[in-house]
């Protein structure tokens, strides 16, 4: 009889452990759902203004294929230009092809004329290699013409239809780039 009671007690305890596990799993699942929900709400909030005018790019940004570009109206040094772009969820322009270079230079001609615009290109102080900010090297046709004899850090900029180099601490306009929102149509 005592053995029977002991067995029942053990079974009840096992059941209790299983229920505690299930509750723990449920709590974890609920927490995960809450986090996902928070992300959805954040995403919705971010997307609503864009969806309202159904534009792939924000106001005052120019679209070309999958990218949006912003041509600054202020001057800054290269590092500050980079931070200004990051503030809008973008980076300094990375030119991937001659087609993109042509689009940029064509747009600049229409907007502002022949000024200097920082892009996301800088020269490694040790190796002298040119690098885009994501770590990739520019294609051979998109290497800056050697113009800077600076002992300081050297960065790339666009002027007219050329890619040139200059001391990163000089003041120039800048161009930011980010992905265009995909249309759901």
């Amino acid at each position: 009889k005592l053995l029977q009671v002991s067995t029942i007690a053990m079974q009840q305890q096992e059941k209790l452990i299983q229920q505690e596990r299930a509750l723990l799993n449920f709590t974890e699942w609920k927490r995960s759902c809450a986090l996902q929900m928070k992300y959805c709400q954040a995403f919705m909030q971010n997307s609503l203004s864009s969806a309202h005018n159904s534009s792939p790019c924000p106001n005052n940004w120019i679209q070309n294929r999958e990218s949006c570009y912003y041509v600054s109206e202020i001057w800054s040094i290269w590092h500050t230009s980079q931070e200004n772009c990051l503030k809008e969820g973008s980076t300094l322009l990375q030119i991937e092809s001659k087609e993109e270079m042509d689009f940029i230079t064509g747009s600049l001609r229409k907007i502002k004329g022949s000024y200097d615009y920082w892009v996301g290109l800088s020269q490694d102080g040790h190796s002298g290699r040119w690098l885009w900010q994501d770590g990739s090297s520019p294609s051979p046709g998109l290497l800056p013409a050697e113009r800077s004899q600076s002992a300081n850090q050297v960065c790339g900029y666009v002027k007219s239809n050329s890619l040139l180099s200059s001391n990163c601490s000089t003041w120039k306009y800048f161009i930011c780039e980010k992905y265009a929102l995909r249309s759901s149509v």
Epitope: K38, F43, N46, E83, K87, E88, G89, S90, T91, Y179
Partner: nanobody
């Protein structure tokens, strides 16, 4: 309001690795990009790596090829994986949340990284 909390710093030997974490708490949808900065004694704070809300990554030349920035959207955390560490990587590492133009950005308190044998 957003709070940023760094962790993962410490002492490591040259050639070693560290993974720094930056956890964001609060109105995270305000943040458009997150950047990792570092400041060594007597030097200016410099941007080491950044990641935008669209997932575009940026690296300073000094860490390119040795560091990787990534994010975990579920846990609202951005990581900086640093490999092949050198003594000159020793600094206090801060994360920064970039908000839109004309808005104030958010900074964490910093985590110390020391590379020495």
């Amino acid at each position: 309001q957003v709070q940023l909390q760094e962790s993962g710093g410490g002492r490591v030997q040259p050639g070693g690795s560290l993974r720094l974490s930056c956890a964001a708490i609060g109105s995270i949808f305000e943040i458009n990009s997150i950047g990792w900065y570092r400041q060594a004694p007597g030097k200016q704070r410099e941007l080491v790596a950044a990641i935008t809300s669209g997932g575009i990554t940026n690296y300073a030349n000094s860490v390119q090829g040795r560091s990787t920035i990534s994010r975990d959207n579920v846990n609202n955390t951005v990581y900086l994986q640093m490999n092949s560490l050198k003594p000159e990587d020793s600094a206090v590492y801060y994360c920064k949340g970039f908000t839109g133009w004309g808005k104030e950005d958010y900074w964490g308190q910093g985590t110390q990284v020391t590379v020495s044998s």
